[in-house]
């Protein structure tokens, strides 16, 4: 019998017959170790590899370059998969990106991009996107013309300021741009008027901090 190929992502997991959302182990090209990820098998047909999740403020996202590179948190809750893994996964084949958002009033929205990949570390994990659709604003709250990733100890933005220090968290900041899903978590009632919160400008404006976010990717040919 031909040996089964290891899963490259959650799409492979889904297509192998595992259609329940949960934690699975994937084997990413050019990565020495397998990686545990959360697979969302419910949203829009399933097969989504979750690369970021916020839900309760239990995890500190104000971290440095190395931690954002290799990832932190636990896929069962809040986590950042790691830029090195995101780069490696999105180098395997063409991917789309879906971002699920929820505000403190219970309203849900999403933004979806037809193409998503990031550059390598030398390229500061530069963001590449195309084809925005969704309900979280007519315009994209992610920089479509490309932005480098910045953290509190790596200032790669297009601002005279230091976006990652001022707004907290690691993100593809411009100057500083219309989003930051890795900002400070603020609870209900404290989430208004926050420059450094979890922001998606074209959904809730420049200073509203969101309740939950999920960033997930899936192959274009799924």
């Amino acid at each position: 019998r031909e040996e089964e190929k290891p899963f490259r992502d959650c799409a492979d997991v889904y297509q192998a017959g595992f259609n329940k959302s949960g934690i699975y182990t994937i084997y990413i090209n050019n990565m020495p170790e397998p990686k545990k990820v959360f697979c969302n098998m419910d949203v829009n047909g399933g097969g989504w590899t979750v690369i970021q999740h916020r839900e309760d403020g239990s995890l500190d996202f104000q971290r440095g370059w190395k931690e954002y590179k290799m990832g932190f948190g636990n896929p069962s809750g809040e986590y950042w998969l790691g830029n090195e893994f995101i780069f490696a996964i999105t180098s395997q084949r063409q991917y789309m990106l879906r971002i699920e958002l929820m505000d403190w009033e219970g309203n849900r929205a999403y933004s979806q991009y037809d193409r998503f990949h990031i550059g390598n570390e030398k390229q500061n994990y530069r963001l590449y996107l195309k084809g925005h659709t969704g309900t979280a604003g007519k315009q994209s709250s992610l920089i479509l013309h490309g932005a480098d990733f910045s953290t509190k100890d790596a200032d790669n933005d297009n601002c005279m300021c230091k976006c990652a220090l001022m707004l907290t968290g690691g993100w593809w900041f411009d100057a500083c741009g219309p989003s930051n899903l890795n900002g400070m978590f603020y609870t209900a009632g404290q989430n208004h008027g926050k420059l450094n919160g979890i922001k998606w400008h074209y959904f809730k404006g420049p200073s509203y901090s969101l309740r939950s976010t999920t960033m997930m990717i899936r192959p274009l040919d799924f």
Epitope: M166, A175, C176, H201
Partner: antibody, heavy 122, light 112 residues
Framework: EVQLVQSGGGVVQPGRSLRLSCAAS????????MHWVRQAPGKGLEWVSY????????YYADSVKGRFTISRDNAKNSLYLQMNSLRAEDTAVYYC???????????????WGQGTLVTVSS | DIVMTQSPLSLPVTPGEPASISCRSS???????????LDWYLQKPGQSPQLLIY???NRASGVPDRFSGSGSGTDFTLKISRVEAEDVGVYYC?????????FGQGTKLEIK
Amino acid sequence: EVQLVQSGGGVVQPGRSLRLSCAASGFTFSSYGMHWVRQAPGKGLEWVSYISSSGSTIYYADSVKGRFTISRDNAKNSLYLQMNSLRAEDTAVYYCARDLLDYDIWTGYGYWGQGTLVTVSS
Amino acid sequence: DIVMTQSPLSLPVTPGEPASISCRSSQSLLHSVGYNYLDWYLQKPGQSPQLLIYLGSNRASGVPDRFSGSGSGTDFTLKISRVEAEDVGVYYCMQGTHWPPTFGQGTKLEIK
């Protein structure tokens, strides 16, 4: 490189009009709020007017309200200040200035034009 | 309007020595978003102003680390740890917490 290049200054008689322009380059102009700030000869800085990135929000200093009009053309990457009913006390170097941060999150002036002198004299 | 009061108005300094400029506001500048909207600008002779410090204590890119800003509420300070000849000019504080934005009257730093 961010650049703000100003034009339109000059000598004008009291009661007359003048239009200042500020041509922006090196950044996504339509994402930034813009300001006019002036400086009378030998004096300090005075904020004059503000326009949001889309042009939907506009503010004026009391000293120019009703006489000056700020506008922008995002397609042309340009900012304007139409100055009517000019007075001697409007004599100043006028600077256009860009918000430090985009998306109308205001934390001050990140970039300034070179300034243009407006002299109101009979 | 918020009144910004700087002191001293004139500051003669020997190169290599420290310098300090005070800026007081007539009302607290601590904004509801948790920041003090207080900036420091330097206008060198014959030039446009340039941003030094934003949000009270954050140094703008390209500004030497000998410049630092501190303070909260109504009292703010700009410090230069070791003055250099290129630091001459007029220093302005500016508040943006309360509309309209207002500037201090300026502090002229000159080399002794």
